[in-house]
Interface confidence: low
């Protein structure tokens, strides 16, 4: 079964995934999707890095790590209940079928009720977006998938390949963590 | 098993508005986003776009900018198109596929006309 | 936009033949990762269309395998053993590597 995991509505989620370049900024390809990894890539995807930077994300997704390190783990925030259910880490290693797969359920759970502060403080204000801060802009054109042939800032999601539904629940129970060359 | 619906055949004129639906059953709606394809009588397939059915968020390919919507009800496992201000040339049958277009829906076809 | 030229446009053939459909792009199909986009369908008459191949030669679920396609980069075959009357149809291959993704103009598969 997936490594669980656990969150309360409002507060941020972290989703673990790691791997180890084989060379400092020798960057493999990842994708975070929602629902288990199919049989190839990520089904709708929320955030996807390149061989050299994130290419993609949605808001309230980011990657609050070193991924030019290896750490992809995935930051949700604010999470509320529909945020629970199973995300997909995909470490796309060059070579077919070579890809490294990670299913991580998300367990979100009612906020504790606690008497409420006389003046909530702005949200966004006490979270600033990460992906602001590391320089990454929103997409101009959201085009599909890793696409090798269109400019980084245009490039948005999708499943670059076909699966058979059959196996579009191949789970696995290891940890995310894995090395690379 | 896999299933993808959508609304029955519609006449229309030049001018109007068309939103068609396209029902998913058998997996989970919101791990597969949703295409949309067109096929003018007699012609090929043509890729429209599609929309992501988690982050709600539609990608339009270049001929399908402007009078095109794609919009989803997460709740009813349902994605629509929406065409506005139709024209001649939008006759034609649409078809929904799911993801990469493993599965499709049976088409709707759509006739404007005056 | 990456142009999908399939050949023939009609092919006439016998029941129990051997049938051949060529597409090829005017870009390189093929991903850095490895893998090549190029897939197939079936499309009968007053029908959605089918997947019948996926990533140049791998069959989709159900598919007999008496279907099989093959090639790589720019140019694609499908191929179909002993063609039984539920083949008829139109063929399309298509790439889903570069935006828009597209399709090529169809191959008729009729009784000759």
């Known amino acids: 079964s997936e490594v669980e995991y656990r969150a309360e509505v409002g507060q941020n989620a972290y989703l673990p995934c790691f791997y180890t370049p084989a060379a400092p900024g020798n960057l493999v390809p990842v994708c975070w999707g929602k629902g288990a990894c199919p049989v190839f890539e990520c089904g709708n995807v929320v955030l996807r890095t390149d061989e050299r930077d994130v290419n993609y994300w949605t808001s309230r997704y980011w990657l609050n790590g070193d991924f030019r390190k290896g750490d992809v783990s995935l930051t949700i925030e604010n999470v509320t209940l529909a945020d629970s259910g199973i995300y997909c880490c995909r470490i796309q290693i060059p070579g077919i079928m070579n890809d490294e797969k990670f299913n991580l359920k998300l367990v979100i759970k009612p906020a504790k009720v606690t008497p409420a502060p006389t003046r909530q403080r702005d949200f966004t204000a006490a979270f600033p977006r990460m992906l602001t801060t590391r320089g990454h802009g929103p997409a101009e054109t959201q085009t599909l998938g890793s696409l090798p042939d269109i400019n980084l800032t245009q490039i948005s999601t999708l499943a670059n390949e076909l699966r058979d539904s059959r196996l579009a629940n191949d789970l696995r129970d290891s940890g995310a963590t894995i090395r690379i060359g | 098993q896999i299933q993808l619906v959508q609304s029955g055949p519609e006449l229309k004129k030049p001018g109007e508005t068309v939103k068609i639906s396209c029902k998913a059953s058998?997996?989970?709606?919101?791990?597969?986003?949703m295409n949309w394809v067109k096929q003018a009588p007699g012609k090929g397939l043509k890729w429209m776009g599609w929309i992501n059915t988690y982050t709600g968020e539609p990608t339009y390919a270049d001929d399908f900018k402007g009078r095109f919507a794609f919009s989803l009800e997460t709740s009813a496992s349902t994605a629509y198109l929406q065409i506005n201000n139709l024209k001649n040339e939008d006759t034609a049958t649409y078809f929904c596929?799911?993801?990469?277009?493993?599965?499709w829906g049976q088409g709707t076809t759509l006739t404007v006309s005056s | 936009d990456v142009v999908m030229t399939q050949t023939p446009l009609s092919l006439p053939v016998s029941l129990g033949d051997q049938a051949s459909i060529s597409c090829r792009s005017s870009q390189s199909l093929v991903h850095s990762n490895g893998n090549t986009y190029l897939h197939w369908y079936l499309q009968k008459p007053g029908q959605s269309p089918k997947l019948l191949i996926y990533k140049v030669s791998n069959r989709f679920s159900g598919v007999p395998d008496r279907f099989s396609g093959s090639g790589s980069g720019t140019d694609f075959t499908l191929k179909i053993t002993r063609v039984e009357a539920e083949d008829l149809g139109v063929y399309f291959c298509s790439q889903s590597i570069h935006v828009p993704y597209t399709f090529g103009g169809g191959t008729k598969l009729e009784i000759k």
């Open positions: 596929a799911r993801d990469l277009m493993d599965y």
């Open positions: 058998g997996y989970t709606f919101t791990n597969y986003g």
